[in-house]
């Protein structure tokens, strides 16, 4: 994870929840301590955990860029969710920045598809 | 009574391979994350890599990740670091240390890696 | 990376006297995860202090922690001639796990 959260609201309990670890992985939403005797939990809103693991730090939760919206919030056991901004979309090839749609389909072509934020307007030629 | 006793250092040309190994004694060996730390001659600590207990996960600091691989064999209470494609500001006093997060408790007495043509 | 900053860098001080490391982090670190050593020349470091402020098997109670947030203190009440060494402070919050760049307690 490049992008991480450095200024975390933290809604968990001040006291972290703790549990043994079962045939030495923790559950989701928790990492395990140096001593593998406890399962320690993920702070709200700071990092997180998707699956039964052994790390000794939780997973530190994506930050929004500037130009993404926040879809989901990062919660205990899943990361934050960003999505491009409207009028934007992001490419497969390159994913880490939004890009700006098209406005409109070159001459001869008609626009068959709107503009979302996996993907560019798509156009076709026209029927002749 | 704790014991770290690192093996493996020695003289390396620049993009040459060593393997530094740990053997642990008197502790639950395979319960315990452990760690490298570095120490440049005349210089500070610099943390280089974590394993966790059970040895599935494991971390590196930026400045060697790609090169270097640790790794523990829990059956013989040993832990390991692979150092591929050294540099010369690789050279160091290398210390095995038992802990990760919270402290360093147990340090072994360090071995030497120069890395010089 | 969380970077700890000590201060003073070299503290010069006679037996008996009070000496007071400082270390500062870039962001906030959880009490929890701050602990210091002390290394002296040829030797490995050795815990002094852990969770800021407890003390690890074996360390005189001259030696004390405190502090939170991103503020930590390391107190030698009366220097021994044997406390005359670089001490560090460490953080391990976030990965990675990094040191601060030591203060030397030397005799004066």
């Known amino acids: 994870i490049t992008r991480q959260s450095l200024d975390p609201q933290r809604r968990a309990a001040p006291q972290q929840k703790r549990s043994s670890p079962t045939e030495g992985l923790c559950p989701p939403g928790h990492h395990i301590s140096e001593d593998s005797r406890e399962c320690i939990s993920c702070k709200y809103g700071q990092d997180y955990s998707t699956h039964w693991n052994d790390f000794l730090f939780c997973l530190r939760c994506t930050k929004c860029d500037s130009g993404e919206v926040e879809v989901n919030s990062c919660t205990t056991t899943r990361n934050t969710v960003c999505q491009c901004e409207e009028g934007t979309f992001r490419e497969e090839d390159s994913p880490e920045i939004c890009r700006k749609c098209r406005t409109g389909c070159p001459r001869g072509m008609v626009k068959v598809k709107d503009c979302t934020p996996w993907s560019d307007i798509e156009c076709v030629h026209k029927e002749s | 009574e704790v014991q770290l006793l690192e093996s493996g250092g020695g003289l390396v040309q620049p993009g040459g391979s060593l393997r530094l190994s740990c053997a642990a004694s008197?502790?639950?060996?395979?319960?315990?994350?452990m760690s490298w730390v570095r120490q440049a001659p005349g210089k500070g600590l610099e943390w280089v890599s974590a394993?966790?207990?059970?040895?599935?996960?494991?971390y590196y600091a930026d400045s060697v990740k790609g090169r270097f691989t640790i790794s523990r064999d829990n059956s013989k209470n040993t832990l390991y670091l692979q150092m591929n494609s050294l540099r010369a500001e690789d050279a160091a006093v290398y210390y095995c240390?038992?802990?990760?997060?919270?402290?360093?408790?147990?340090w072994g007495q360090g071995t030497l890696v120069t890395v010089s043509s | 990376e969380i970077v700890l900053t000590q201060s003073p860098g070299t503290l010069s001080l006679s037996p008996g006297e009070r000496a007071t490391l400082s270390c500062r982090a870039s962001?906030?670190?959880?009490?929890?995860?701050l602990a210091w050593y002390q290394q002296k020349p040829g030797q490995a470091p050795r815990l002094l202090i852990y969770?800021?402020?407890s003390r690890a098997t074996g360390i005189p109670d001259r030696f004390s922690g405190s502090g939170s947030g991103t503020d930590f203190t390391l107190t030698i009440s009366r220097l021994e001639p044997e406390d005359f060494a670089v001490y560090y402070c460490?953080?391990?919050?976030?990965?990675?796990?990094?040191f601060g760049q030591g203060t030397k307690v030397e005799i004066k």
């Open positions: 240390a038992k802990g990760v997060r919270k402290k360093f408790d147990y």
């Open positions: 008197g502790f639950t060996f395979s319960s315990y994350a």
């Open positions: 394993i966790s207990g059970s040895g599935g996960s494991t």
């Open positions: 962001q906030s670190v959880s009490s929890s995860y």
């Open positions: 969770g800021a402020s």
């Open positions: 460490q953080q391990g919050q976030l990965p990675p796990i990094t």
